[in-house]
Amino acid sequence: MAVTACQGLGFVVSLIGIAGIIAATCMDQWSTQDLYNNPVTAVFNYQGLWRSCVRESSGFTECRGYFTLLGLPAMLQAVRALMIVGIVLGAIGLLVSIFALKCIRIGSMEDSAKANMTLTSGIMFIVSGLCAIAGVSVFANMLVTNFWMSTANMYTGMGGMVQTVQTRYTFGAALFVGWVAGGLTLIGGVMMCIACRGLAPEETNYKAVSYHASGHSVAYKPGGFKASTGFGSNTKNKKIYDGGARTEDEVQSYPSKHDYV
């Protein structure tokens, strides 16, 4: 029951996380104009991974996509790639995990198969979450670096005639959405991996056991060979010289939950 709950919760958390990663990737507010210490209040700029937007003081907002690949910074391309890889891996993970759910029966799928699928989806969710966190962090680092560079420029340019005024950009809402979503996907993946351990069946030792009476009532097959159980053939054809229960390979075995008399 706990395994089913852990698996189900892991699936739901990952689903929310991947939805968040998709939302963050599509959002326009990855970088927004810093309103504090902003010399130009008439214009408000904000950028996403796919397009740039500007809102005028009149309320008019215009967005335009980055339809070129060549003129874009390499970092932006890297962030796009990380987010897309995260979404693709997450989507595949979700697909796999649906079939792996313990509460869903598909034909005669064994628990071992479900355990493997749960582990696979868990690993995919973990990598997906890490990709999203990495992508958002790379973009954030790019903003932070530029923010402090622009701050230095603002103050070094104060002596004498300032030729160019720089408006700084800060973290947009998409970065926070991305971080949280990546974290949720990661947590969901870990939960799926934990659930996998509970789903995996215990290793069973199907060793043949011969049960026979001790003392005078020893049953012999013609030819003096020991009768074999249903678990494999008695290839060794070893004679019984003493009473008690022995396995085929003469190793002492104790009755388990899988042995039926």
Epitope: S52, L76, M142
Partner: nanobody
């Protein structure tokens, strides 16, 4: 350090023409758009025209049909061709360039249209 250098301003008669140019120099890359804004005395800065990297430019209603913005992406330069100028076009014209992580503004250039 990035610099935006504006040129081409001055005094002109109503109905006349002027061509403003703005060149971005320094370590600037990945410009999304370059634009011209106008600030009339005692008023706030308003958009005149914006040239995006791709697609058609954007114009303020008051200058449509009279002003033309063009951009040389290779030189990181934007031009504003102003025809049939009116006294209300008087003001300080600011050039701006916008990138993924920063916005840059020139020091402005005075354009005066006398009637």
């Amino acid at each position: 350090q990035v610099k935006l250098e504006e040129s081409g301003g001055g005094l002109v008669q109503a109905g006349g023409s002027l061509r403003l140019s703005c060149a971005a120099s320094g370590s600037i890359s990945g410009i999304n758009y370059m634009a011209w804004y106008r600030q009339a005395p005692g008023k706030q800065r308003d958009l005149v025209a914006r040239a995006w990297t791709t697609g058609p430019p954007t114009y303020a209603e008051s200058v449509k049909g009279r002003f033309t913005i063009s951009r040389d992406n290779a030189k990181n330069t934007v031009y504003l061709q102003m025809n049939n100028l009116k006294p209300e076009d008087t003001g300080v014209y600011y050039c701006t360039a916008n990138t993924l992580t920063s916005g840059y503004w020139g020091q402005g250039i005075q354009v005066t249209v006398s009637s």
